[in-house]
Interface confidence: low
């Protein structure tokens, strides 16, 4: 899988999109696990309703938030007063038994606050290529990974 | 093989600076977020500042912001720490250590390479 | 900011011996969580990240456990080179990063 790149402000929401086909993952539950390293496991952090027919209700742990348009075959991850520790790899899933198919493997990355100027020296600002003008909107802005471009480099 | 190196401690009047390296090789520094861990003298660890893997993101601890700088260079893989109006208390061993995770700065992985250390003394 | 509280903070034991360190978090850290060993004079080594993934290169007579609040390292078979300093760390919340205050493994 490619690494999708979803950047968010801190502070704010991110919203994370995950498309996938909806016939091929009929009746399977979905999750959003974060990856612990290069090579250890992908740790869950939420999953949809117990119930497949109840995926569209929002489920959340702490602040995250999980839920499915298993018609539309797109899953979304909302995660809430987004922080510096919130970055990292994560994985979309689709649920089968004991196994977890990859849907999109996503990077988050957490951009400084452009309004908090608490250390103004030290804040990079987004470029203008990305909007961030109203402070209360779920900003996502998402990329693709380069094939060259890995989120977790080969152990040295 | 994966190393830091550490350098530019010393002993320094309380209210002057004093800036330290960190030189790194054996890894793709480039990738990683980056760390300063201090230690006083008989005392615990104490982690100082961290920078995202492309210097876009910096965070200290409360006992530093306003006085210390941590940045870096990719180009010349090494890592900074300005220290200015150095205070007694900022006596101690400093290491520079790299974060595990890797591409977007620390996050919730811990430390897997850390230098030798170089003591910084703030004495009149 | 997140307090981590290990114990004990010394511990005698023999070569051979089960020795278990705990750290308690003030807040539910999930599985956030790294131990460390450090010897005197020389930098810390990273021994256990996410509370329970060995790294590399670390012998398995160490392990991790524990999730939320409640972590425990433990040597399963005492060797004469553990004998050192252990922390723990969390770096899910942060700034700042905390380490624990540190628990000495001394001869007995």
């Known amino acids: 899988h490619n690494t999708t790149v979803f950047q968010g402000v801190a502070g704010q929401s991110l919203q994370v999109s995950c498309p996938y086909d909806s016939m091929k993952h009929w009746g399977r539950r979905k999750a959003w696990c974060r990856q612990l390293g290069e090579k250890g496991p992908c740790q869950r952090v939420v999953s949809t309703h117990n119930l497949w027919l109840l995926s569209f209700l929002r489920r959340w742990n702490g602040s995250t938030a999980i839920t499915d348009d298993t018609l539309g075959g797109t899953l979304t991850i909302t995660l809430r007063n987004l922080q510096p520790h919130d970055a990292g790899l994560y994985q979309c899933q689709s649920l089968h038994g004991s196994e977890a198919d990859t849907l999109r493997k996503v990077l988050v990355e957490v951009l400084a606050d452009p309004l908090d100027h608490r250390d103004a020296g030290d804040l990079w600002f987004p470029g203008e290529s990305e909007s961030f003008e109203d402070a209360h909107v779920e900003h996502s802005i998402s990329r693709s990974l380069l094939e060259g471009e890995i989120p977790f480099p080969p152990t040295s | 093989q994966v190393q830091l190196v550490e350098s530019g401690g010393g002993v320094v009047q309380p209210g002057r600076s004093l800036r330290l390296s960190c030189a790194a090789s054996g890894f793709t520094f480039s990738s990683y977020g980056m760390h300063w861990v201090r230690q006083a003298p008989g005392k615990g660890l104490e982690w100082v500042a961290v920078?995202?893997?492309?210097?876009?993101?910096?965070y200290y601890a409360d006992s530093v912001k306003g006085r210390f700088t941590i940045s870096r260079d990719n180009s010349k893989n090494t890592l900074y720490l300005q220290m200015n109006s150095l205070r007694a208390e900022d006596t101690a061993v400093y290491y520079c250590a790299k974060d595990l995770g890797g591409y977007y700065g620390g996050a919730a992985y811990g430390m897997d390479v850390w230098g030798q250390g170089t003591t910084v003394t703030v004495s009149s | 900011d997140i307090q981590l509280t290990q114990s004990p903070s010394s511990v005698s034991a023999s070569v051979g011996d089960r020795v278990t360190i705990t750290c308690r978090a003030s807040q539910d850290i999930s599985s956030w969580l790294a131990w460390y060993q450090q010897k005197p004079g020389k930098a810390p080594k990273l021994l256990i990240y996410a509370a329970s993934s060995l790294q590399s290169g670390v012998p398995s007579r160490f392990s991790g456990s524990g999730s939320g609040t409640d972590f425990t390292l433990t040597i399963s078979s005492l060797q004469p080179e553990d004998f050192a300093t252990y922390y723990c760390?969390?770096?899910?919340?942060?700034?700042?990063?905390?380490f624990g205050g540190g628990t000495k493994v001394e001869i007995k």
């Open positions: 920078i995202w893997y492309d210097g876009s993101n910096k």
């Open positions: 760390q969390q770096e899910v919340d942060y700034p700042p990063l905390t």
